[in-house]
């Protein structure tokens, strides 16, 4: 039978670490991490890490009992967790019978938005105390709400990930820019900024709260040339406060009456 892995939480040091081993398996050949989407009972879904690793093809694989994977996450707070993946069989060959290196994976570490993760893995039995243990590590930065996987998460939807304001902005004259956008049912307060290298105009927008999308318009006084300037629309939804997803557009010349209005609905990350 071919070996598989059975993985479970192991928070403290592995028991093998306390024993002396004359020989230990070699290090991993490769370690990779990617996010995967899994459904949860609430109707939302969670993002988990798919951690996959490749074993080095040599006879030291015969000593291999397990591989331990530890993840440290750094965002607003720090998290740390480990799993130990035991091999169900001893390795009888250095490569898979069908060809290629032995490759295994574990799906289970939860992924939060915009978080840097440090993933480390080492084989067990590991090197003796006071010896350099063969290990491998990779970094993984989880995406934010604009990511194609993340944007449908409830937290992201509440931050406006699915809202498309369809911003249009045009220079009416040397002193003013007209900004039009589609409001969101998530909230009724917005701020529109016009900036070149610096902010040349801004306006707070408060629309009557309604549970549907409407088109809002605001005329913003500007202090200098506005054609080609960037418009940034920041929503203030109750669910995300000042950390909601911002949207961008570009100021063009206002068309003459009867000419179709050019659209520009580029998006940016929060804070962009």
């Amino acid at each position: 039978r071919e070996p598989t892995v059975q993985c479970g939480s192991e928070t403290g040091p592995s028991p093998e670490w306390m024993l002396r081993h004359d020989l230990t398996p070699g290090d991993l050949r490769d370690l990779r991490v990617e996010p995967v989407k899994t459904s949860v009972a609430t109707g939302d879904y969670s993002i988990l890490m798919n951690v996959s690793w490749v074993l080095r093809a040599d006879a030291s694989i015969r000593l291999l009992k397990a591989t331990k994977i530890c993840v440290t996450g750094k965002s607003n707070f720090q998290s740390y967790s480990c799993v130990r993946c035991n091999y169900t069989e001893a390795f009888q060959t250095q490569t898979r019978p069908s060809g290629g290196k032995w490759t295994f994976s574990y799906i289970g570490f939860p992924v939060e938005l915009n978080t840097v993760y440090f993933i480390g893995a080492h084989n067990i039995p590991n090197a003796n105390m006071n010896e350099d243990g063969p290990s491998m590590s990779v970094n993984f930065t989880s995406p934010g709400c604009l990511d194609h996987i993340m944007k449908y998460k409830k937290k992201c939807v509440k931050a406006g990930s699915l809202w498309d304001p369809n911003i249009t902005a045009c220079k009416k004259n040397e002193e003013t820019v007209e900004v039009n956008f589609t409001t969101s049912p998530l909230g009724n307060r917005y701020m529109a900024l016009i900036q070149h290298s610096t902010i040349i105009g801004f306006s707070q927008v408060s629309e009557p709260y309604q549970n549907k999308q409407t088109r809002a318009s605001v005329v913003i006084p500007v202090t200098e040339e506005s054609e080609g300037a960037m418009v940034q629309l920041t929503p203030y939804f109750p669910t995300c406060g000042s950390d909601c997803i911002r949207h961008k557009g570009t100021v063009v010349l206002c068309p003459q009456t009867g000419v179709p209005f050019p659209l520009d609905n580029n998006r940016s990350k929060p804070g962009g």
Epitope: G26, A57, R62, Q94, T95, G99, G100
Partner: antibody, heavy 118, light 107 residues
Framework: QVQLVQSGAEVKKPGASVKVSCKAS????????MNWVRQAPGQGLEWMGR????????QYNQKFKDRVTMTRDTSISTAYMELSRLRSDDTAVYYC???????????WGQGTLVTVSS | DIQMTQSPSSLSASVGDRVTITCRAS??????LAWYQQKPGKAPKLLLY???NLADGVPSRFSGSGSGTDYTLTISSLQPEDFATYYC?????????FGGGTKVEIK
């Protein structure tokens, strides 16, 4: 049955390169590492390196690292070993040898004599 | 690199003799050892792997033993076709190395 058939004998001048081929049959080529071993006249066996035909991972003996290139063509189940900047002490029989479950050499080619002489 | 030291480098024996060849590794190779037989002008032939396992078609008069760093190949009753050179090889991890060889000659 498993067979490894190597290319014919070569005579080369010092500084030249030689490329030896090893055609495998009778098994799934990508399932086993292919090794190259050489034997100088009247001498012992010397492991030069190995290639995994599945993904072309190569591990060389440091002694040859700068001069040897191992490749493979899975479409014709053939492994190649090229040795460059030949010297007279590279005169040897070069063998391809297929690994077993681990790196014991279960099957060998018939050998290719490479003579380096000015 | 792991060094493999084989002894003796040559020996003379008669048909029916029991022959023993030893191989010492410079470090523990965890029984990852193979033995080969080579006749003049021919490629080596695998005799044993993992110290004790006979390769396909190898007669049972060949046997192996040992662990750690010290290993032995024994031919229980030498036959005329056994006169050849024998090599040990470790496969604990690259680079793989062979012993210097033991030439078994007719007395």
């Amino acid at each position: 049955q498993v067979q490894l058939v190597q290319s014919g004998a070569e005579v080369k001048k010092p500084g030249a390169s030689v490329k030896v081929s090893c055609k495998a049959s009778g098994y799934t080529f990508i399932s086993y590492w292919m090794n190259w071993v050489r034997q100088a006249p009247g001498q012992g066996l010397e492991w030069m390196g190995r290639i995994d035909p599945y993904d072309s991972e190569i591990q060389y003996n440091q002694k040859f690292k700068d001069r040897v290139t191992m490749t493979r063509d899975t479409s014709i189940s053939t492994a190649y070993m090229e040795l460059s900047r030949l010297r007279s002490d590279d005169t040897a029989v070069y063998y391809c040898a297929r690994s077993g479950g681990f790196d014991w050499f279960a099957y060998w080619g018939q050998g290719t004599l490479v003579t380096v002489s000015s | 690199d792991i060094q493999m030291t084989q002894s003796p480098s040559s020996l003379s024996a008669s048909v029916g003799d029991r022959v023993t060849i030893t191989c010492r590794a410079s470090e523990n190779i965890n029984s990852n050892l193979a033995w080969y037989q080579q006749k003049p002008g021919k490629a080596p032939k695998l005799l044993l792997y993992d110290v004790t396992n006979l390769a396909d078609g190898v007669p049972s008069r060949f046997s192996g033993s040992g662990s750690g760093t010290d290993y032995t190949l024994t031919i229980s009753s030498l036959q005329p076709e056994d006169f050849a050179t024998y090599y040990c090889q470790h496969f604990w991890g690259p680079p793989y190395t062979f012993g210097g060889g033991t030439k078994v000659e007719i007395k």
